[in-house]
Interface confidence: medium
């Protein structure tokens, strides 16, 4: 058939939906690949065509938009399932074309099963709450566009398997779930089940997210360098291995980029003509405070290296700090004969 700009399989959009629930999937062409929207394309006389390849098959097939009760339909740039079936899993393609223009992209759709406690292979979004910070809310995600504002759905919230009723610090408020004060014990999976009527049928939307309680910005401090410090002196003889750890504590800060780096004589180690290796390890506390350790290593240190300035730097959204390591050349013990000779006044 005619040439078509093929964007291939967009694996960034690994769409997962629950079996036997409605799903609305927008054609990714207009969201990620083209510079114009569906309305513009439609006005210009371009046609949006959908087709799919079933799981474990190579054959491209049209989507049957003529199923009983309109189970699969298309509305503008949205493909609708009312509801999904397990065998809807496959790669879906939307193709935009007319006689002179063609562009298409495929994306994988996986219909997954859930158990009675909402466990499933679904990848869960994570919502972070600040510890002991006051009232915070999570909102039932990805339910926009499923029903008009005139429809009032019923929403039931669960923590794990348990319906949230009479919890001390967690209160369901429609599409929102309010945490009066968040504790580590509030970590876990929370599920909202949205039930709404449409054309004499009842549909359910299940949305699960993971709540992670993290350090509060009220308690956040600039990075703290635990090592190097003034109490430790790195005394080495030439030829020995020099190991200096830089250990930095970072308070949890939402969307902060935590950085640790060494300078040697004010330059990056890569810009110094010595054989330096730096190994990093990271650990987290329960509230996602972070401790980063960067160990600077020089296998065979020279007397020149021992005269250099070694400074550990750290930066977060809260500020930047630096600390120099105290590095010295070990003074060798005097040789016995010389010492004696000097002691007895020998010339």
């Amino acid at each position: 058939s005619e040439r078509c700009d093929d964007w291939g399989l967009d694996t960034m959009r690994q769409i997962q939906v629950f079996e036997d629930e409605p799903a609305r999937i927008k054609c990714p062409l207009f969201e990620h690949f083209l510079k114009f929207n569906y309305s513009t394309a439609h006005s210009a006389g371009l046609t949006l065509i959908w087709y799919w390849t079933r799981q474990d098959r190579d054959l491209e097939e049209p989507i049957n938009f003529r199923l009983p009760e309109n189970r699969i339909s298309k509305e503008k740039d949205v493909l609708w399932f009312r509801p999904t079936l397990l065998n809807d899993t496959g790669n879906y393609t939307c193709m935009l074309r007319n006689t002179t223009y063609c562009s298409k992209v495929a994306f994988p759709l996986e219909v997954v099963q859930k158990d009675s406690c909402f466990n499933s292979p679904m990848k869960l979004p994570v919502h972070k709450l600040y510890i002991e910070y006051g009232i915070q809310r999570i909102t039932c995600p990805n339910v926009d566009g499923y029903f008009p504002s005139s429809v009032k759905p019923t929403i039931t919230w669960y923590m794990g398997c348990y319906k949230i009723q009479n919890f001390n610090n967690v209160i369901p408020e429609g599409m929102n779930l309010s945490f009066l004060i968040a504790f580590i014990s509030n970590n876990g999976n929370y599920t909202c089940v949205v039930t709404y009527p449409e054309n004499g049928r009842t549909f359910h939307l299940t949305r699960t997210l993971t709540v992670k309680v993290v350090g509060s910005p009220k308690n956040a401090v600039p990075p703290v360098i635990h090592s190097p410090n003034d109490h430790v002196v790195y005394e080495k003889e030439p030829g020995e291995e020099l190991l200096i750890p830089c250990t930095v504590y970072f308070s949890f800060l939402m969307d902060s980029r935590n950085e640790v780096w060494w300078t040697i004589d004010g330059k990056k180690p890569d810009d110094i003509p010595i054989d330096v290796t730096i190994n990093e390890s990271i650990s987290h506390s329960r509230t996602e405070d972070e401790t980063r350790t960067q160990i600077l290593s020089i296998k065979k240190v020279t007397s020149e290296d021992l005269k250099r300035s070694y400074v550990c730097h750290a930066r977060s959204a809260k500020g930047e700090v630096a600390k120099a390591a105290t590095v010295k050349q070990k003074v060798p013990a005097p040789r016995y004969t010389v010492e004696l000779a000097c002691g007895f006044g020998a010339t």
Epitope: S1, H42, G45, T47, I49, Y51, E60, E61, P62, N64, F65, R66, L67, P68, E69, N70, S73, K74, E75, W80, R82, M95, R97, N98, T99, E198, N199, G200
Partner: antibody, heavy 119, light 108 residues
Framework: QVQLLQSGAEVKKPGSSVKVSCKAS????????IDWVRQAPGQGLEWMGG????????NSAQNFQGRITITADKSTNTAYMELSSLRSEDTAVYYC????????????WGQGTMVTVFS | EIVLTQSPGTLSLSPGERATLSCRAS???????LAWFQQRPGQAPRLLIY???RRATGIPDRFSGSGSGTDFTLTISRLEPEDFAVYYC?????????FGGGTKVEIK
Amino acid sequence: QVQLLQSGAEVKKPGSSVKVSCKASGGTFSIYAIDWVRQAPGQGLEWMGGIIPIFGTENSAQNFQGRITITADKSTNTAYMELSSLRSEDTAVYYCARNGATSDAFDIWGQGTMVTVFS
Amino acid sequence: EIVLTQSPGTLSLSPGERATLSCRASLSVSSNYLAWFQQRPGQAPRLLIYGVSRRATGIPDRFSGSGSGTDFTLTISRLEPEDFAVYYCQQYGSSPLTFGGGTKVEIK
């Protein structure tokens, strides 16, 4: 402007088959569904089935299944509807219609082919 | 299958009058996949309205469609001589595609 041109009238005997063609001109043929609708004399419209030429997959109404074959030839921009085991109640005008670009409704129709079945 | 019932069977009106044609579905027509066609004697049907209320290319604005769920209406605000014909509603979202029995608009 897209046009659908159908083959000429047919007179058939009961038990035989008829194959009606529908040739598209003036636009992209393969990406739209071509459907078949019939109308018995003095009666309403009845959907028979359709095909999307780009994929070659047909689907048809249950009361025609086993008797109807819908095919398409992309090289000649032509769709075909073959109806077998003809009976007198199959006497009707048979229309092809394009399942439209912007609407999904039948926006362009052929002129119709009269098929008469009698012994 | 979705059964479409059109009423009235015949509508006798004069040019310039308003025509209101009804189409009732046995099941809800979701996604607004409902169309109206006009058929004049000896001619193929012509698409007037699709998606319940959207006018097809070249259709004058005296034709309008409305409704949702199971009840749909085609309104011709002022009848012109060429509007006297048979009108069919059709749902095209659910297989099998079905047409209503038609309403004949005739000159009084």
